[in-house]
């Protein structure tokens, strides 16, 4: 039987067993959600893109999954992050009380994971997936993360706070999830400011990457949508990492505040 | 306490059948994903096949699909691994294990199959 | 399937000693990684879980650290009940795949 070619990698081998077992696993890992049924949470991503054509979806698609997730992060507990999601997890993974959009349910599911299906047809498509760039931006992953985020940005409240990549050009990039979803998401209402974490990559680089003009943008949109915005470095992730573990550690004085400047916008 | 206990295990000539059985005891056999691991004599270990809770979803390692399944009866609190068309290479102590937080946190103590001629 | 690669295969060091074993993942896997112990002729027995949480009973000479691909486990003082084969095992995408074990011996 003919099938597209699509420019993307195909689904990820055997998702739907990692699915099932990834949402048993943060079930038992997270009593307050013991009572989600795993089959139906299945069953309903699966209803979001299995028979549709892939570059044809939209975050309607997704909202019977969405209803089954529906979780909450208690006020000044949401960390954001912009293309630095392995540091932004180990400090989640120490520090306990603070939640990425993949500590939640959906966004545990789905991490790093790919899928899409075909019109009319029931079958997973393990060949090729479409390209968010060379094929189309509405295909399953996308509007997914696209969708589990805006949600998460919706509910935040208090401070919120975002890490982000010192080492890239454009540490603050308008076409990034954070960027293009969450930063517009953010309820001025509920969110009383925004914190910034910039993290540096070269160990000698003592640069004020809070002075950066992508920073001074984000500072900028911020502050229109009347959130309060302050910005951190953080020169050092290891010792930022290690004086997370370990507050008490006599090189940590106040906790965090040793390993970064501090700057108020 | 948590117990699990094989049995089924023996001699038996490659293309022919055997069934395993792991009887589980001290916990809500139902409210678990219950694994078969096999260990091949002195080598690693390689996980085999899974069932989770409600029975409606069992999957299997590509050495074995099509010919091994995986079925769970909650009214006897047991797990059964069904091997069909044996081959030499399927020799090993075979365990069934109880996978929580995504754990194998008990296990049996293994059944020996051999297959042989 | 994600490989689980162990080092070193063997070792042997005496009691007192501290042990470290590797384990690599050939992609990120988070957290997702737990420590199992093996003596002969016995079934596996979990130590670690979700790479650094201690499971209920075992010694706290025993540790687990690490994240993404690099994982460690850690016997910070070696006894002669430790003698066994250590095997780490990833469940972050399926199917669950173990590493071909670590063989400990007491000098």
């Known amino acids: 039987r003919w099938r597209q070619q699509w420019s993307g990698s195909g689904t990820t081998s055997r998702f739907p067993e990692t699915v099932l077992a990834r949402c048993v696993k943060y079930t038992e890992v997270h009593p307050e959600m013991r009572h989600v049924d795993c089959q139906s949470v299945w069953d309903a991503f699966k209803g979001a893109f299995i028979s549709k054509y892939p570059c044809n979806i939209t975050e309607e698609d997704y909202q019977p999954l969405v209803k089954l997730g529906t979780q909450t992060v208690p006020c000044n507990k949401t960390l954001l992050w912009s293309r630095i999601k392995d540091l932004a997890h180990q400090f989640t993974q120490v520090q306990r009380d603070m939640f990425t959009l993949e500590d939640m349910l959906l966004g545990y599911l789905a991490d790093d994971l790919t899928w899409c299906g075909e019109f009319n047809t029931f079958e997973i498509n393990y060949q090729s997936c479409p390209d968010w760039r060379k094929d189309c931006s509405n295909n399953p992953v996308s509007v997914f993360w696209k969708t589990v985020s805006r949600r998460f940005a919706e509910t935040a409240c208090g401070v919120v706070h975002v890490m982000l990549n010192g080492s890239r050009s454009k540490i603050f990039d308008k076409n990034s999830t954070f960027g293009s979803v969450e930063v517009h998401n953010l309820q001025p209402e509920k969110v009383q400011a925004l914190e910034a974490w910039v993290i540096h990559g070269g160990r000698e680089d003592s640069r004020d990457l809070c002075q950066d003009p992508t920073i001074k943008e984000l500072e900028s949109i911020i502050s229109k949508r009347n959130i309060r915005f302050f910005c951190k470095n953080i020169y050092r992730p290891d010792k930022f990492l290690q004086c997370v573990k370990n507050p008490e550690d006599s090189s940590c004085l106040s906790g965090i505040s040793a390993s970064h400047h501090h700057h108020h916008h | 306490q948590v117990q699990l206990v094989e049995s089924g295990g023996g001699v038996v000539q490659p293309g022919r059948s055997l069934r395993l059985s792991c009887a589980a005891s001290g916990f809500t056999f139902s409210s678990y994903g219950m694994h078969w691991v096999r260990q091949a004599p002195g080598k690693g270990l390689e996980w085999v096949a899974v069932i989770w809770y409600d029975g409606s979803n069992k999957y299997y390692a590509d050495s074995v699909k099509g010919r091994f399944t995986i079925s769970g009866d909650n009214s006897k609190n047991t797990l059964y691994l069904q091997m069909n068309s044996l081959r030499a290479e399927d020799t090993a102590v075979y365990y069934c294990?109880?996978?929580?937080?995504?754990?194998?946190?008990?296990w049996g103590q293994g059944t020996l199959v051999t297959v042989s001629s | 399937a994600i490989q689980m690669t162990q080092s070193p295969s063997s070792l042997s060091a005496s009691v007192g000693d501290r042990v470290t074993i590797t384990c690599r993942a050939s992609q990120g896997i988070r957290n997702d990684l737990g420590w199992y112990q093996q003596k002969p002729g016995k079934a596996p027995k979990l130590l670690i879980y979700a790479a650094s949480s201690l499971q209920s009973g075992v010694p706290s000479r025993f540790s687990g650290s690490g994240s993404g691909t690099d994982f460690t486990l850690t016997i910070s003082g070696l006894q002669p009940e430790d003698s066994a084969t250590y095997y780490c095992l990833q469940d972050y995408i399926y199917y669950p795949t173990f590493g071909q074990g670590t063989k400990v011996e007491i000098k």
């Open positions: 294990a109880r996978m929580f937080r995504g754990a194998f946190d008990y």
